[in-house]
C-alpha cells in the first residue's frame, strides 16, 4: 500500500474514523527502534508517537487519535534523527470501517431480511453472506443502508450469516478495508440455530402409503 | 461520468480579486478532497491550493498563502477559489481536480483563464 | 519541498516508435508518482499512477515503472494521437511537485 521506501514497507488504517494506525516494515531496520513523528498541519511542528506498537521488543507502528478527520496526516519515520520515510497521506482513503453492531434477522416465510445499526457516516455498503451446507459456496448481497432483504430461501435449510462493512470505491478510492466480519449465526425454520450440520442431513424418506 | 467545469476566470488589474468556481458532478462531491492547479501561458503545472471534503482541512502554496482561499459548498457540489492581492504572476489557467486517493489527481475540469495585468 | 526532474525536455520520434521518458525525485517519494499526458489547449489528462497502475480507460501501450527517486513512463508503440507533453507529478509528500514536462514531437 505504502511502497517501498528505503526498504520501508508502509500501512495506513483509519479505524472507524476514530483511530489512525501506521504500521512499517523495515528489514534493513529490523532490530531498530524506529520513531514515528507527525503532524496534521503542514505548519505545525512534529509530534512524537506517545502510543508504539511493537514487534518483537522493537517499534512497529503508531496509534493516533484522529477523531472524523478526513484531512492529511503528514508523518516521517526516523532512525535517530535521520529520516528513513518521510510523506503524507489523505487519511479517509484508508477508512476500515467498524463492523456491524446489533444484527437482527427479522423472518418472513422464504425471505429474512438482516438489520444492524447504520454507521454515523455514509457511502458505505452493508454486505450480508450467507450459505446453507448445500452450498459450495457464499452468496452475498449489499446494500447502502444496513437493511438487507435476501429472498427466495429454503425454510427447511439451516443457513449461516454474516454481516460486514465496506467503503464504496467510487467514493473512498482502492486502499480502504472492510470491516471484519461479524460473528456467524446460524438460522432454520425462523429460528437460531447453534450451528448448521457441516453435511447436509440427506431428505427423510417419504412413508409410502 | 466525472465532470469539473470551472468558471469565474477573466481579466482584473493587479491587486485585484477573483472568484473562481468549479461544479462538479458525477461522483460523491462531498467526500472527495479536491485541488486547484495552474499552467502559467507556455509554462508547466503548478499545484495551487486543496481542500478535504468536508472543508475542515485546507493547503495552500506558500506562492498564495495569505492571499487565496480554498472553500466548498457541499450541497451545492460546488468548489471555490476567491483570490485577492492578484499579481501578474498569478496569470494562468487554473484546473479544478478531484482527489483520487492513492490514484493521484484523477479527473481535471478543462480549465478557465486568468489574467491579470493593468 | 521535493523537485521533480525529467528528461528530456523534449524529444522528436515517429510513429511506431517506442518512447521513454523519465522522471527523478530529489527525495524518496516511495511508488507515489503519477504521469499525465496535456495536448494543446487541454487539460492533463492521468494516464498512471502509484508508479505502475494505468487509470481506467487508459490503453495499455502506456507503461510506468520506478521506485524511491528514478521513474520511467514508456510509451510501447507511438500513435499520432500520442504527441503530447508528458508530466510527472509526486504525491507521496505535500505540496505535491510536477516536472517540467517533456514534449513529445513528430520527427
Known amino acids: 500500500q505504502g511502497g517501498a521506501a528505503e526498504g520501508v514497507q508502509i500501512q495506513i488504517i483509519y479505524f472507524n474514523l476514530e483511530t489512525v494506525q501506521v504500521t512499517w516494515n523495515a528489514s534493513k531496520y529490523s532490530r531498530t527502534n524506529l520513531t514515528f513523528h507527525y503532524r496534521f498541519n503542514g505548519d505545525e511542528a512534529y509530534d512524537q508517537c506517545t502510543n508504539y506498537l511493537l514487534q518483537e521488543g522493537h517499534t512497529s507502528g503508531c496509534l493516533l487519535d484522529a477523531e472524523q478527520r478526513d484531512d492529511i496526516l503528514y508523518f516521517s519515520i526516523r532512525n535517530g534523527t535521520h529520516p528513513v520515510f518521510t510523506a503524507s497521506r489523505w487519511m479517509v482513503y484508508y477508512l476500515k470501517p467498524s463492523s456491524p453492531k446489533h444484527v437482527r434477522f427479522s423472518w418472513h416465510q422464504d425471505a429474512v431480511t438482516v438489520t444492524c445499526s447504520d454507521l454515523s457516516y455514509g457511502d458505505l455498503l452493508y454486505e450480508v453472506q450467507y450459505r446453507s451446507p448445500f452450498d459450495t459456496e457464499w452468496q452475498s448481497k449489499q446494500e447502502n443502508t444496513c437493511n438487507v432483504t435476501i429472498e427466495g430461501l429454503d425454510a427447511e435449510k439451516c443457513y449461516s450469516f454474516w454481516v460486514r462493512v465496506k467503503a464504496m470505491e467510487d467514493v473512498y478510492g482502492p486502499d480502504t478495508y472492510p470491516s471484519d466480519w461479524s460473528e456467524v449465526t446460524c438460522w432454520q425454520r425462523g429460528e437460531i440455530r447453534d450451528a448448521c450440520a457441516e453435511t447436509p442431513t440427506p431428505p427423510k424418506p417419504k412413508l409410502s402409503k | 461520468e466525472v465532470q469539473l467545469l470551472e468558471s469565474g476566470g477573466g481579466l482584473v488589474q493587479p491587486g485585484g480579486s477573483l472568484r473562481l468556481s468549479c461544479a462538479a458532478s458525477g461522483f460523491t462531491f462531498r467526500s472527495s478532497a479536491m485541488h486547484w492547479v495552474r499552467q502559467a501561458p507556455g509554462k508547466g503545472l503548478k499545484w495551487v491550493s486543496s481542500v478535504s471534503g468536508s472543508g475542515a482541512g485546507t493547503y495552500y502554496a506558500d506562492s498564495v498563502k495569505g492571499r487565496f482561499t480554498i472553500s466548498r459548498d457541499n450541497p451545492k457540489n460546488t468548489l471555490y477559489l476567491q483570490m485577492n492581492s492578484l499579481r501578474a504572476e498569478d496569470t494562468a489557467v487554473y484546473y479544478c481536480?478531484?482527489?483520487?486517493?492513492?490514484?493521484?489527481?484523477?479527473?481535471w475540469g478543462q480549465g478557465t483563464l486568468v489574467t491579470v495585468s493593468s | 519541498d521535493i523537485q521533480m526532474t525529467q528528461s528530456p525536455s523534449s524529444l522528436s520520434a515517429s510513429v511506431g516508435d517506442r518512447v521513454t521518458i523519465t522522471c527523478r525525485a530529489s527525495?524518496?517519494?516511495?511508488?507515489?508518482l503519477a504521469w499525465f499526458q496535456q495536448k494543446p489547449g487541454k487539460a492533463p489528462k492521468s494516464l498512471i499512477y502509484?508508479?505502475?497502475s494505468l487509470q481506467s480507460g487508459v490503453p495499455s501501450k502506456f507503461s510506468g515503472s520506478g521506485s524511491g527517486t528514478d521513474f520511467t513512463l514508456t510509451i510501447s508503440s507511438l500513435q499520432p494521437e500520442d504527441f503530447a507533453t508528458y508530466y510527472c507529478?509526486?504525491?507521496?509528500?505535500?505540496?505535491?511537485?510536477f516536472g517540467q514536462g517533456t514534449k513529445v514531437e513528430i520527427k
Open positions: 507529478q509526486q504525491y507521496n509528500l505535500y505540496p505535491p511537485t
Open positions: 502509484t508508479a505502475s
Open positions: 527525495q524518496d517519494i516511495s511508488n507515489y
Open positions: 481536480v478531484k482527489e483520487g486517493g492513492s490514484r493521484g489527481f484523477d479527473y
